[in-house]
């Protein structure tokens, strides 16, 4: 069967958009660092890049292969309000490259980091 260029272009475009790559996401600061519920950040979220997208096999997972760290300054507010919003600088992981890896490789990579 012969498919017209528009159909192929549309499929290719979808493929490119959904492939495993660093994507801009909003990270909830409190959840990222598991801070106490009486600590608030203003703004509550920051924008960073994290790996995401689809891998063409169910046995593969989109994982980061390199990471940089971004420093962002936010206001931190803690209850009881002994002081007002105070500026704090926090370092966030920013994924710079990604790869579809087998779940076994992911397991090995995570555990080698833990052992180190």
């Amino acid at each position: 069967a012969h498919y017209n260029t528009e159909i192929l272009k549309s499929i290719d475009n979808e493929w490119r958009k959904t492939q495993c790559m660093p994507r801009e996401v909003c990270i909830d600061v409190g959840k990222e660092f598991g801070v106490a519920t009486n600590t608030f950040f203003k703004p509550p979220c920051v924008s960073v890049y994290r790996c995401g997208g689809c891998c063409n096999s169910e046995g593969l997972q989109c994982m980061n292969t390199s990471t940089s760290y971004l420093s962002k300054t936010l206001f931190e507010i803690t209850v009881p309000l002994s002081q007002g919003p105070k500026p704090v600088t926090i370092s966030f992981a920013n994924h710079t490259s990604c790869r579809c890896m087998s779940k076994l490789d992911v397991y090995r990579q995570v555990h080698s980091i833990i052992r180190r």
Partner: antibody, heavy 121, light 108 residues
Framework: EVQLLESGGGLVQPGGSLRLSCAAS????????MSWVRQAPGKGLEWVSA????????YYADSVKGRFTISRDNSKNTLYLQMNSLRAEDTAVYYC??????????????WGQGTLVTVSS | QSVLTQPPSASGTPGQRVTISCSGS????????VSWYQQLPGTAPKLLIY???HRPSGVPDRFSGSKSGTSASLAISGLRSEDEADYYC???????????FGGGTKLT
């Protein structure tokens, strides 16, 4: 010492305009969200409008939406409320209030002494 | 009519304990932190309780706040004559996208 000082109130005719100011001192104004709250004579408190610390977000009560505009000048440590198309029911004492974290902590920890706005012909 | 419901009045004698209720819904008290304010005659409101149950420095421990579900309450123990005032609860309403106050309770 934290101080909030409102000014700009007075007598105005229905349909008229007024601009309220709130001069802040004794704290880092640019790190706090701010609100205006009003109280009609002999009535309870009614929240009017709020603005985020960085001027990025503004919120209004339905009763003033489209008529009032909240703004701030962090370089002057001042909060404003521009009131247009004033009605008799806008007659109230207007307070400015400091808010450590808008829509999260939900608390006004310091209040000004208030300025009276009277709308009457 | 206020979004948050408070009894219009409450009364007590010196030394007694009184409780003021504040009833709301899932979009306000049910999902947001509550504050309480005291307004003495002819003065600006003053923060009494924030984050449901915390007292700012300078507020006596006779005042306490609590929240359960869509209701909050303010308790004043060891009543004093200087506690005679109007008391208001307040919180954010996620549906209205703004702050809401109770109608106020006059304590005598």
């Amino acid at each position: 010492e934290v101080q909030l000082l409102e000014s700009g109130g007075g007598l105005v005719q229905p349909g008229g305009s007024l601009r309220l100011s709130c001069a802040a001192s004794g704290f880092t104004f640019s790190s706090y969200d701010m609100s205006w709250v009003r109280q009609a004579p002999g009535k309870g408190l009614e929240w009017v409008s709020a603005i985020s610390y960085d001027n990025g977000s503004t919120y209004y009560a339905d009763s003033v939406k489209g008529r009032f505009t909240i703004s701030r000048d962090n370089s002057k440590n001042t909060l404003y409320l521009q009131m247009n198309s004033l009605r008799a029911e806008d007659t109230a004492v207007y307070y400015c209030a400091r808010d450590p974290y808008l829509a999260r902590l939900n608390t006004f920890d310091y209040w000004g002494q208030g300025t009276l706005v009277t709308v009457s012909s | 009519q206020s979004v948050l419901t408070q009894p219009p009045s409450a009364s007590g004698t010196p030394g007694q304990r009184v409780t003021i209720s504040c009833s709301g819904s899932s979009s306000n008290i049910g999902s947001n932190n509550v504050s309480w304010y005291q307004q003495l005659p002819g003065t600006a409101p003053k923060l009494l309780i924030y984050y449901n149950s915390h007292r700012p420095s300078g507020v006596p421990d006779r005042f306490s706040g609590s929240k359960s579900g869509t209701s909050a309450s303010l308790a004043i123990s060891g009543l004093r004559s200087e506690d005679e005032a109007d008391y208001y609860c307040a919180t954010w309403d996620s549906s209205l996208n703004g702050y809401v106050f109770g109608g106020g309770t006059k304590l005598t």
